[in-house]
């Protein structure tokens, strides 16, 4: 039975040129996390694997930094970064849990930053 839930930063906004932390947290399950994938629509951004550590997709290497924790930091934001981001938790024995974050990158300097989410 998949009892777990994913808490995410939800809908967030950030300024063009700035950076943002995408973070998810899996709770309410005894399942053990083996790997977390970060995806933007259908594009793989990064993988955090239990054995191999972090792998950032080559096309995002300059603008994506691993962490904090299982989260992901996006840097040098552009308006094209606006869209849906997914954290995909591969767990044993439950299987896959997916969380969704919507990021809006604003031209304006009055972008309201979503509350930063910290994994305990």
């Amino acid at each position: 039975m998949m009892t777990g839930t994913i808490e995410t930063t939800g809908n967030i906004s950030a300024e063009k040129g700035g950076s943002i932390i995408l973070q998810c947290h899996l709770s309410s399950t005894t399942a053990q996390v083996t790997q977390v994938n970060w995806e933007q629509q259908d594009q793989l951004l990064a993988i955090c694997n239990a054995d191999l550590g972090w792998h950032i997709s080559p096309s995002f290497k300059d603008r994506v930094a691993p962490g904090p924790g299982l989260g992901l930091t996006l840097q040098s934001l552009t308006v094209n970064d606006t869209g849906e981001y997914f954290c995909i938790y591969h767990t044993y024995p439950d299987g896959t849990y997916t969380g969704r974050i919507f990021l809006e990158v604003l031209e304006s300097s009055v972008a309201e930053h979503g509350a930063r989410f910290q994994i305990p």
Partner: antibody
């Protein structure tokens, strides 16, 4: 390379207890769950449950609640299965296997430990 | 509890293709059952071949593949080798526990 090495065969009397070990190497022990599976003579494989090696929380299959205990020693990357109040029907080969969440399942297995319960 | 069924025995010629199946008494097998296939040769430890329906284990030859076929999980060996002669067990996940099949004895002859 990943290896799960189990302790040697045991012969016990009914009512006694036994504790068998499964020592892991070749990977970070606390990153993967550990399962216990048994095979009684002439019987099929039965999943006994698993233990979260990060939190230490065990999950037991219904049939194996009560006399069976999963524990860990993370300092030595070892998982343990203890069976109390042994019965003749506990005679079996007990296997540990690693639980992987990326393509869910059991990817590496120990060689098995034969436990014989006989008066 | 669900019953998981496998062919008791199958025979394949060297270089031939064989498909082992794994069915559930509860209905069609789906990806949520995370079908696993493990191999056991006499006197050797179990070897994980396939996890999560179609995920090949590390070091497992490409001739082994997993899929869903006609409501069952399937293990296909394409170009069978003499060393593939072994017992093959499937396991299916049912919400909170694994159930193993009775095993298929594969002979390469």
């Amino acid at each position: 390379q990943v290896q799960l090495v189990q302790s040697g065969a045991e012969v016990k009397k009914p009512g006694a207890s036994v504790k068998i070990s499964c020592k892991a190497s070749g990977y970070t022990f606390t990153n993967y769950g550990m399962n216990w599976v048994r095979q009684a003579p002439g019987q099929g494989l039965e999943w006994m449950g698993w233990i979260n090696t990060y939190t230490g929380e065990p999950t037991y299959a219904q049939k194996f609640q009560g006399r069976f205990t999963f524990t860990l020693d993370t300092s030595t990357s070892t998982a343990y299965l203890e069976i109390s109040s042994l019965r003749s029907e506990d005679t079996a080969v007990y296997y540990c296997s690693r639980g992987n969440g990326y393509y869910v399942g059991m990817d590496y297995w120990g060689q098995g430990t034969l436990v014989t319960v006989s008066s | 509890q669900a019953v998981v069924t496998q062919e008791p025995s199958l025979t394949v010629s060297p270089g031939g293709t064989v498909t082992l199946t794994c069915g559930s008494s509860t209905g069609a097998v789906t990806t949520s059952n995370h079908a696993n296939w493990v191999q056991q040769k006499p006197g050797q430890a179990f070897r994980g071949l396939i996890r999560g329906t179609n995920g090949r284990g590390s070091g497992v030859p490409a001739r082994f593949s997993g899929s869903l076929l006609g409501g069952k999980a399937a293990l296909t060996i394409s170009g069978a080798q003499p060393e593939d002669e072994a017992e093959y067990y499937c396991a299916l996940w049912f919400s909170n526990h694994w159930v193993f099949g009775g095993g298929t004895k594969l002979t390469v002859l």
